[in-house]
C-alpha cells in the first residue's frame, strides 16, 4: 500500500505567441481545482475509462478576478498535494490524466458552474520511494508544471511497496534473503506476497502466499533441484510431490509479440523486443508521438510530431532501449580490475578498489602505499616513486583530511543550484531542465485539451496489482 502524490507548481499561459484569455473576469470571478486520474501500466485507454489505480480532486483554489487589460498570469492554485492512495502494489509504469477545472462563481441559477480548462496526459515509469519527479505539460496555450512521486505506507517498502518491514527476530541480523529496512535499520524487510521462505532465485508467486517453482526446481519452497531422468520433457511447471517436470507450452510459443516484435524467454515469462514506434508488454502500443512522453528515465524525445513519423529517444547515461526503459548493467562487463567492486551510479561507473590498488579501474598496484593512510575513504595512489591520496567526494588535501566543496566547480548546468551532500553533490534544476547535472531540457508534451467530462471521482474496477 502507498500514496501517489502530485504537487501542482503552476498553471498559466505557455511561452510563445497566442496567450490565452484569462479564464476569469470581474463579472465572472472563478477559482481553479485539479483532478488526477491514474491507471496502471502504459494504457492507451480513453480518458473516460476507469481510473483503476485511483483518482483525486484537489481543494478549490483562491477566488481570482482578472485585472482589466492585464495578460493572463499564472493562476492562483489550491493549497496542498493531490494524494491518490493505492491499496496494493505500485505498478511501476502508469498513465496519468491531470485536468484543470474552472469553477465560475457568478450568480448562476443552481449554484456554481464547472468547465474543463485543460487536460494533459502522459505515461511514465516511476519507482516508489524515489525522489520527486518534475514535469511540464502543455495543453493548447496553457502550461502546467508539476511534480509527482509514489511513496509506500509503512510497513510496506520497496520500489513496488510489496515488501513489509517487521521487527528483527534476532538482534544482529535479518532472516535469509531479507535486508534491513532503511532507514529503519532495527527492522527487516520481509516478503509480503510469496510464501515465507520461498526461494528468491527459484520460486515466484502470482497469488499471495503461494510459492511456484521455476523450471528445474521443486519442493514447498522451490529449494529442491528436479531430477529429470524419469521425465518425458524438460519443460513446464514442476509437480510439487513427484519432482518430475510436466510438459507444457513455452512462453514464446506462437510469438505473443505484436507488430514485428521478437520474443525471448525469461525465467518467469517472456520479454518482447519491440521495433521503434511500438512498445508495451507485447509491443501492442502504437501510434506514439513525443506528445505521449514515451521516453523514460529522463530520455529526450526528438521527432515524431505525428503518428506516422517515428520518434527517437536520446537516453541519458546508464539507460538504453528504444524508450530508454532498460538500465544498462555496465558492471556486467567487469570493468574493475584486481577484485575491485563496481558501482553503477547512473551518470558514471565507479570502481571501489581493494586495499593496495587504485585508479579509475583499480589498475594500479600500490605496493609502496601499504603503510600510507588516506583519511575519509581516500585511496593512496602511486605516482613517480611518491604517493598521493585520491580523495573521496567531498574531501581534499594531501591526506584527504580537508573538507572540499563539491560545488566549487559549478557542476549544475542551465542555472541549476548545487547542494553539497554526504555522498557528493545534488543539483536542483531550474524549471525546464532535468538530469543529474540538469543537462537535459524537458521536452514539452503539447497534449491538446480533450472534450470535457464532468468532475468527480469514478471508482475504478476492483483490480489487484501484486
Amino acid at each position: 500500500a502507498g500514496v501517489f502524490e502530485l504537487q501542482i507548481h503552476s498553471f498559466g499561459p505557455g511561452p510563445g505567441p497566442g496567450a490565452p484569455r484569462s479564464p476569469c473576469s470581474a463579472r465572472l470571478p472563478c477559482r481553479l481545482f485539479f483532478r488526477v486520474c491514474l491507471k496502471p501500466g502504459l494504457s492507451e485507454e480513453a480518458a473516460e475509462s476507469p481510473c483503476a489505480l485511483g483518482a483525486a480532486l484537489s481543494a478549490r483554489g483562491p477566488v481570482y478576478t482578472e485585472q482589466p487589460g492585464a495578460p493572463a498570469p499564472d493562476l492562483p492554485l489550491p493549497d496542498g498535494l493531490l494524494q491518490v492512495p493505492f491499496r496494493d502494489a505500485w505498478p511501476g509504469t502508469f498513465s496519468f490524466i491531470i485536468e484543470t477545472w474552472r469553477e465560475e462563481l457568478g450568480d448562476q441559477i443552481g449554484g456554481p458552474a464547472w468547465s474543463l480548462l485543460a487536460r494533459v496526459a502522459g505515461r511514465r515509469r516511476l519507482a516508489a520511494g524515489g525522489p520527486w519527479a518534475r514535469d511540464i505539460q502543455r495543453a493548447g496555450a496553457w502550461e502546467l508544471r508539476f511534480s509527482y512521486r509514489a511513496r509506500c505506507e509503512p510497513p510496506a517498502v520497496g520500489t513496488a511497496c510489496t515488501r513489509l518491514c517487521r521487527p528483527r527476530s534476532a538482534p544482529s541480523r535479518c532472516g535469509p534473503g531479507l535486508r534491513p529496512c532503511a532507514p529503519l535499520e532495527d527492522e527487516c524487510e520481509a516478503p509480503l506476497v510469496c510464501r515465507a521462505g520461498c526461494s528468491p532465485e527459484h520460486g515466484f508467486c502470482e497469488q499471495p502466499g503461494e510459492c511456484r517453482c521455476l523450471e528445474g526446481w521443486t519442493g514447498p519452497l522451490c529449494t529442491v533441484p528436479v531430477s529429470t531422468s524419469s521425465c518425458l520433457s524438460p519443460r513446464g511447471p514442476s509437480s510439487a510431490t513427484t519432482g518430475c517436470l510436466v510438459p507444457g507450452p513455452g512462453p514464446c510459443d506462437g510469438n505473443p509479440c505484436a507488430n514485428g516484435g521478437s520474443c525471448s524467454e525469461t525465467p518467469r515469462s517472456f520479454e518482447c523486443t519491440c521495433p521503434r514506434g511500438f512498445y508495451g508488454l507485447r509491443c501492442e502500443v502504437s501510434g506514439v508521438t513525443c506528445a505521449d512522453g514515451p521516453c523514460f528515465n529522463g530520455g529526450l524525445c526528438v521527432g515524431g510530431a505525428d503518428p506516422d513519423s517515428a520518434y527517437i529517444c536520446h537516453c541519458p547515461p546508464g539507460f538504453q532501449g528504444s524508450n530508454c526503459e532498460k538500465r544498462v548493467d555496465r558492471c556486467s562487463l567487469q570493468p574493475c580490475r584486481n577484485g575491485g567492486l563496481c558501482l553503477d551510479l547512473g551518470h558514471a561507473l565507479r570502481c571501489r578498489c581493494r586495499a593496495g590498488f587504485a585508479g579509475p579501474r583499480c589498475e594500479h598496484d600500490l605496493d609502496d602505499c601499504a603503510g600510507r593512510a588516506c583519511a575519509n575513504g581516500g585511496t593512496c595512489v602511486e605516482g613517480g616513486g611518491a604517493h598521493r591520496c585520491s580523495c573521496a567526494l567531498g574531501f581534499g588535501g594531501r591526506d584527504c583530511r580537508e573538507r572540499a566543496d563539491p560545488c566549487a566547480a559549478r557542476p549544475c548546468a542551465h542555472g541549476g543550484r548545487c547542494y553539497a551532500h554526504f555522498s557528493g553533490l545534488v543539483c536542483a534544476c531550474a524549471p525546464g531542465y532535468m538530469g543529474a547535472r540538469c543537462e537535459f531540457p524537458v521536452h514539452p508534451d503539447g497534449a491538446s485539451a480533450l472534450p470535457a467530462a464532468p468532475p468527480g471521482l469514478r471508482p475504478g474496477d476492483p483490480q489487484r496489482y501484486l
Epitope: A196, G197, G209, E210, P220, T223
Partner: antibody, heavy 118, light 107 residues
Framework: QVQLVQSGAEVKKPGASVKVSCKAS????????IEWVRQAPGQGLEWMGE????????VYNEKFKDRVTMTVDTSTSTAYMELRSLRSDDTAVYYC???????????WGQGTLVTVSS | DIQMTQSPSTLSASVGDRVTITCKAS??????VAWYQQKPGKAPKALIY???YRYSGVPSRFSGSGSGTEFTLTISSLQPDDFATYYC?????????FGQGTKLEIK
C-alpha cells in the same frame, strides 16, 4: 493478534467421518497456508497436509490422501479438515496451524481431540 | 519421506545448565528446518526457523545452528519455563516431517 480457534472434541465410531473446523482471525486469511498436524496420545507430531485459502490449492501427505479433504470458506475465514473411514489409530489431537510471515508453523489452534472407538 | 532423528529422546538437566539437542535429517534439507516447544496438553510453539533464526518473542537463550543434514537447538541457560518437549521439523520437501521429540526434564 493472530488466532486460530478449533471446533470441540468429537467421538466417532470406526468407519465414520469427522470434520474439524479452524476459524482464523486478525490476518489476511487468503494469503497464508493452513497446515493440519495430528498427534496421537503420547506420540510425536505428524503432518497431514496444507491448503492455501486464496486459491484452494492443497498438498496432502500421501499417507492420508485417499481419506482426507481440506477445504476453506473464505467468507468466514474458516478452514476445514475432513477425515473419512476412521480407524482406532486415528484417535489423536488434530491441530491447525498457519504458515506465517517466516518459514515455519507460526500460529497453532488449541487442538481438537478426536476419539475413534466402537 | 525424509526422516528427522532427534537425540537424545530424554534429557535431564538443571536450571542454569546449557543444553543441546541434535536433529539429523536422512537427506540434505539445506537450512529449511524449524524447532518447536510443546508443553503437556498444549499446542506446539514456534522457536526457530530457517535453522538459525529466532522467531519473534522467543528469548535469546534459544539458538539454532546447522545446515544440510545436522542441526542443533541450544538453550544457553535453562529456565524453569523451558522444561518441555522439543521437536525439529524439515520443510524442504513434501511431506513435512517432524523428529520424534526430545523430552527435557528436571534433574
Amino acid at each position: 493478534q493472530v488466532q486460530l480457534v478449533q471446533s470441540g472434541a468429537e467421538v466417532k465410531k470406526p468407519g465414520a467421518s469427522v470434520k474439524v473446523s479452524c476459524k482464523a482471525s486478525d490476518y489476511t486469511f487468503s494469503n497464508y497456508y493452513i497446515e493440519w498436524v495430528r498427534q496421537a496420545p503420547g506420540q510425536g507430531l505428524e503432518w497431514m497436509g496444507e491448503i492455501l485459502p486464496g486459491n484452494g490449492n492443497t498438498v496432502y501427505n500421501e499417507k492420508f490422501k485417499d481419506r482426507v479433504t481440506m477445504t476453506v470458506d473464505t467468507s468466514t475465514s474458516t478452514a476445514y479438515m475432513e477425515l473419512r473411514s476412521l480407524r482406532s489409530d486415528d484417535t489423536a489431537v488434530y491441530y491447525c496451524a498457519r504458515w506465517g510471515d517466516y518459514a515455519l508453523f507460526a500460529n497453532w489452534g488449541q487442538g481438537t481431540l478426536v476419539t475413534v472407538s466402537s | 519421506d525424509i526422516q528427522m532423528t532427534q537425540s537424545p529422546s530424554t534429557l535431564s538437566a538443571s536450571v542454569g545448565d546449557r543444553v543441546t539437542i541434535t536433529c539429523k535429517a536422512s537427506q540434505n534439507v539445506g537450512t529449511n528446518v524449524a524447532w518447536y516447544q510443546q508443553k503437556p496438553g498444549k499446542a506446539p510453539k514456534a522457536l526457530i526457523y530457517s535453522a538459525s533464526y529466532r522467531y519473534s518473542g522467543v528469548p535469546s537463550r534459544f539458538s539454532g545452528s546447522g545446515s544440510g543434514t545436522e542441526f542443533t537447538l541450544t538453550i544457553s541457560s535453562l529456565q524453569p519455563d523451558d522444561f518441555a518437549t522439543y521437536y525439529c521439523q524439515q520443510y524442504n520437501s513434501y511431506p513435512f516431517t517432524f523428529g520424534q521429540g526430545t523430552k527435557l526434564e528436571i534433574k
